[in-house]
């Protein structure tokens, strides 16, 4: 009887539904091609029920199959912008634990200006996701424009 | 024990999986951006369980966090069409109640002919979703390219 | 009391957790266009939790509601290349049985090198779902530039 | 059950101009998708202008020189084509594809044949 009590005496976090969306606070310092993002209802859409951030970095804290989504928008960008710059590339992937690195997720811009994806991970509690835009192009911090989030879906 | 005889009684559509997905039926009239949406499985593999459809906009019936996800490709498009016909943007947001006027999500579509993202949200019961294409182009209505959608995440 | 027994008696399968995540293992020989995918904890993130693979496609075993999700993306690519090689176009879509034979997912590269992106279908048993990429450029096998994936979502 | 008639296509010199009719036996509506595709011998069925609801989108072919536009009163649209080419020979359908309460539905005219002479 232990999964039906579990949902009857457990908060909402218990059963599984973790989920966080998250919006971007800033690029990192030189040398440093990590995005620093930042959540919360005080800030507008963006939140974080279960994972929380350590430095601007997502952290996990439920083992299980995660959905993960990022959208990115360069700012002040046309199509030249974007291949004048090539490349300039989006990698998203577990950073620490360094036993854990790896990269989940990764896009370049080429002519575009706005990459989007999404993909389903194992992730494990304690695992942080890092987020890393190579070149120098700036991302736009419109809210509409670039976020990153995670959904737990199951065990 | 309220939540297991919650689950015991109440129908699907109490358990708080609302989704819906939708296809392309027509673009508004000169000086309307929005498209006009359809679903029902009359027309093919589009459904709505639990939203509703408001003179072709998407109302939300069900507090939560959702995942929206939107496809659209523009028709009889190269990428010297897209370029050309610059800026052809898309939006998705919160149109109605006024109050709650919103951009969730935007994307331009450059040098490319197919837009396509996601991102999880906060909506309330009674917000209408509206999706703006500016510019000149016709999008695709080939089920297959241009669609349209939300998934109930969590309360 | 069907529903809360059915949760405490019956495996995670049961409840209706279908997910799976592929990388790619190979492309087809001539004339077949179709992707070739694999998945498994030995390969990698990769990982079946219901559905099968059945020669390269990925065969359902529970009706439903199902997220389906896709990133492609061409190896030794650049925005000329993709532009020079036009159309490429990545489909998914049911191709067996026979008489439930759609397409459900459409990309053309046009000047980029990767496409993405999601959608909600109606699956059942048996279906099984191919990715045909037409052209001719490889697409990559690294695991974080091309995966493709389904996530059973409700009934 | 809407039927459509196209009508002036003919021989023309290369670099001349010519106007496509396609006329309707009932209401073309603002929200229909009407279009002109082409097919030359031994070629796909090509989509070269599509318009609905004051949108337009061209073939990279043909923009510039092709214009589509439509006549509501008279339920009639039209495709005006300028600075034809000898690539430009086709057979020129008029399609309107509606959306119903069962889907899309196409409605094709018989064709009209265009041939540019160099």
């Known amino acids: 009887q232990r999964f039906a009590q579990a949902q009857q005496q457990l908060p909402l976090e218990s059963l599984g539904w973790d989920v966080a969306e998250l919006q971007l606070n800033h690029t990192g310092p030189q040398q440093d091609p990590r995005l620093y993002w930042q959540g919360g209802p005080a800030l507008g859409r963006s939140f974080l029920h279960g994972p929380e951030l350590d430095k601007g970095q997502l952290r996990i804290h439920r083992d299980g199959i995660y959905m993960v989504h990022i959208q990115v928008t360069l700012a002040i960008c046309s199509s030249t912008t974007a291949s004048r710059h090539h490349p300039t590339t989006l990698a998203v992937g577990i950073c620490s634990p360094a036993s854990r690195s790896i990269s989940l997720l990764r896009l370049s811009f080429h002519q575009g200006c706005t990459i989007a994806s999404q993909r389903l991970t194992p992730l494990a509690r304690g695992d942080t996701l890092c987020t890393n835009l190579t070149g120098t192009l700036l991302p736009s911090r419109n809210t509409d424009e670039t976020f990153f989030g995670v959904q737990w879906v199951r065990p | 024990q309220r939540f297991a005889q919650a689950q015991q009684q109440l129908p699907l559509e109490s358990l708080g999986w609302d989704v819906a997905e939708l296809q392309l039926n027509h673009t508004g009239p000169q000086q309307d951006p929005r498209l006009y949406w359809q679903g029902g499985p009359a027309l093919g593999r589009s459904f709505l369980h639990g939203p509703e459809l408001d003179k072709g906009q998407l109302r939300i019936h069900r507090d939560g966090i959702y995942m929206v996800h939107i496809q659209v490709t523009l028709a009889i498009c190269s990428s010297t069409t897209a370029s050309r016909h610059h800026p052809t943007t898309l939006a998705v947001g919160i149109c109605s109640p006024a109050s709650r006027s919103i951009s969730l999500l935007r994307l331009s579509f450059h040098q490319g002919c197919t837009i396509a993202s996601q991102r999880l949200t906060p909506l309330a019961r009674g917000d209408t979703l509206c999706t703006n294409l500016t510019g000149t182009l016709l999008p695709s209505r080939n089920t297959d390219e241009t669609f349209f959608g939300v998934q109930w995440v969590r309360p | 009391q069907r529903f809360a027994q059915a949760q405490q008696q019956l495996p995670l399968e049961s409840l209706g957790w279908d997910v799976a995540e592929l990388q790619l293992n190979h492309t087809g020989p001539q004339q077949d266009p179709r992707l070739y995918w694999q998945g498994g904890p030995a390969l990698g993130r990769s990982f079946l939790h219901g559905p099968e693979l059945d020669k390269g496609q990925l065969r359902i075993h529970r009706d439903g509601i199902y997220m389906v999700h896709i990133q492609v993306t061409l190896a030794i690519c650049s925005s000329t290349t993709a532009s020079r090689h036009h159309p490429t176009t990545l489909a998914v879509g049911i191709c067996s049985p026979a008489s439930r034979s759609i397409s459900l997912l459409r990309l053309s590269f046009h000047q980029g090198c990767t496409i993405a992106s999601q959608r909600l279908t109606p699956l059942a048993r048996g279906d099984t779902l191919c990715t045909n990429l037409t052209g001719t450029l490889l697409p990559s096998r690294n695991t974080d530039e091309t995966f493709f994936g389904v996530q059973w979502v409700r009934p | 059950q809407l039927q459509l008639v196209e009508s002036g296509g003919g021989l023309v010199q290369l670099g001349g101009s010519l106007t496509l009719s396609c006329t309707a036996s009932?209401?073309?509506?603002?929200?229909?998708?009407v279009g002109w595709y082409r097919q030359a011998p031994g070629s796909d069925r090509e989509l070269v202008a599509l318009t609905s609801n004051m949108r337009t989108n061209y073939a990279d072919s043909v923009e510039g020189r092709f214009t589509i536009s439509r006549d509501n009163a008279k339920n009639t649209v039209y495709l005006q084509m300028n600075s034809l080419k000898p690539e430009d020979t086709a057979v020129y359908y008029c399609?309107?594809?509606?959306?119903?309460?069962?889907?899309?539905?196409?409605?094709w005219g018989q064709g009209t044949q265009v041939t540019v002479s160099s």
């Open positions: 399609n309107v594809n509606r959306m119903t309460s069962y889907g899309p539905r196409d409605y």
């Open positions: 009932g209401i073309i509506f603002n929200s229909d998708y």
